[in-house]
């Protein structure tokens, strides 16, 4: 995936609800720093739905690819109001950006 293209997608579609930087504040959605390798519903200090907490998967490229295509299908009961990204290449770009930005 292309990190720069992914950053644009993040700004357009995700940044209104999420921050990515270390120590970034929770908004409508949780801060995403340290996302990769973390289980669902475990960002410290954010109140998740039971659906999110109970999903029990680890965030990595494959799980994010599936989730970002259709969040409500992947985690029924999630409070994330986002229809998803149908284009595979766009999801790959967004994931590349998330991988970089959430670990710096």
């Amino acid at each position: 995936g292309d990190v720069e293209k992914g950053k644009k997608i993040f700004v357009q579609k995700c940044a209104q609800c999420h921050t990515v930087e270390k120590g970034g504040k929770h908004k409508t959605g949780p801060n995403l720093h340290g996302l990769f390798g973390r289980k669902t519903g475990q960002a410290p200090g954010f109140t998740y739905t039971d659906a999110n907490k109970n999903k029990g998967i680890t965030w990595k490229e494959e799980t994010l690819m599936e989730y970002l295509e259709n969040p409500k299908k992947y985690i029924p009961g999630t409070k994330m109001i986002f229809a998803g990204i149908k284009k595979k290449t766009e999801r790959e770009d967004l994931i590349a950006y998330l991988k970089k930005a959430t670990n710096e």
């Epitope: 340290g34 490229e61 710096e104």
Partner: antibody
């Protein structure tokens, strides 16, 4: 207790193929990546590749692309490494490991493969 | 593909000394770096992940640092049980290559 149990030592002839197994207990392999790592005698670690058992998605180091095939059977919680067209260069200890990006990191005890006529 | 260059290849140090092992990536790996310890005849064990986070049960004399392309593992007050080989591995993009290793011998 989390454990990765690898199959026993193998002695095989040049040109043959072999399939090594790695059975997990104490965790579900669908929850992480399963990797295979090669270590030749007195040498360093070489990453062969990984599988995401939940999706079947595999990634390989290009230098092992034509040599190795990684598969997983989620029903038996087992990962496999098949090595083909064996030569003396394939003589090594092969480790399976379960890890992704975090603190979860478990390794098998290693399987010794000897290729000799 | 990202290549990992680890140095030194070997070193000898006394109990109580501080040693530092470095790993240089051929591209930015954005802190996706782990350090492993391996004793002869044993499987590798995770020491550090995400460049600086200590794995569960790892003594605090071990510490990881770095960013971008340059990373290091520091062992303070070396103990006899710290002998063995140390490897870095990056997790940024596949292949997730290892460094060449550092053999640490206790004087």
């Amino acid at each position: 207790e989390v454990q990765l149990q690898q199959s026993g030592a193998e002695l095989v002839k040049p040109g043959a193929s072999v399939k090594l197994s790695c059975t997990a207990s104490g965790f579900n392999i669908k929850d992480t990546y399963m990797h295979w790592v090669k270590q030749r005698p007195e040498k360093g670690l070489e990453w062969i590749g990984r599988i995401d058992p939940a999706s079947g998605n595999t990634k390989y180091d290009p230098k092992f692309q034509d040599k190795a095939t990684i598969t997983a059977d989620t029903s038996s919680n087992t990962a496999y490494l098949q090595l083909s067209s064996l030569t003396s260069e394939d003589t090594a200890v092969y480790y399976c490991a379960g890890y992704d990006y975090g603190n979860f990191d478990y390794w098998g005890q290693g399987t010794t493969l000897t290729v000799s006529s | 593909d990202i290549q990992m260059t680890q140095s030194p290849a070997s070193l000898s140090a006394s109990v109580g000394e501080t040693v530092t092992i470095t790993c240089r990536a051929s591209g930015n790996i954005h802190n996706y770096l782990a350090w492993y310890q391996q004793k002869p005849g044993k499987s590798p064990q995770l020491l550090v992940y995400n460049a600086k986070t200590l794995a569960d049960g790892v003594p605090s004399r071990f510490s990881g640092s770095g960013s971008g392309t340059q990373y290091s593992l520091k062992i303070n007050s070396l103990q006899p049980e710290d002998f063995g080989s140390y490897y870095c591995q990056h997790f940024w993009s596949t292949p997730w290559t290892f460094g060449g290793g550092t053999k640490l011998e206790i004087k």
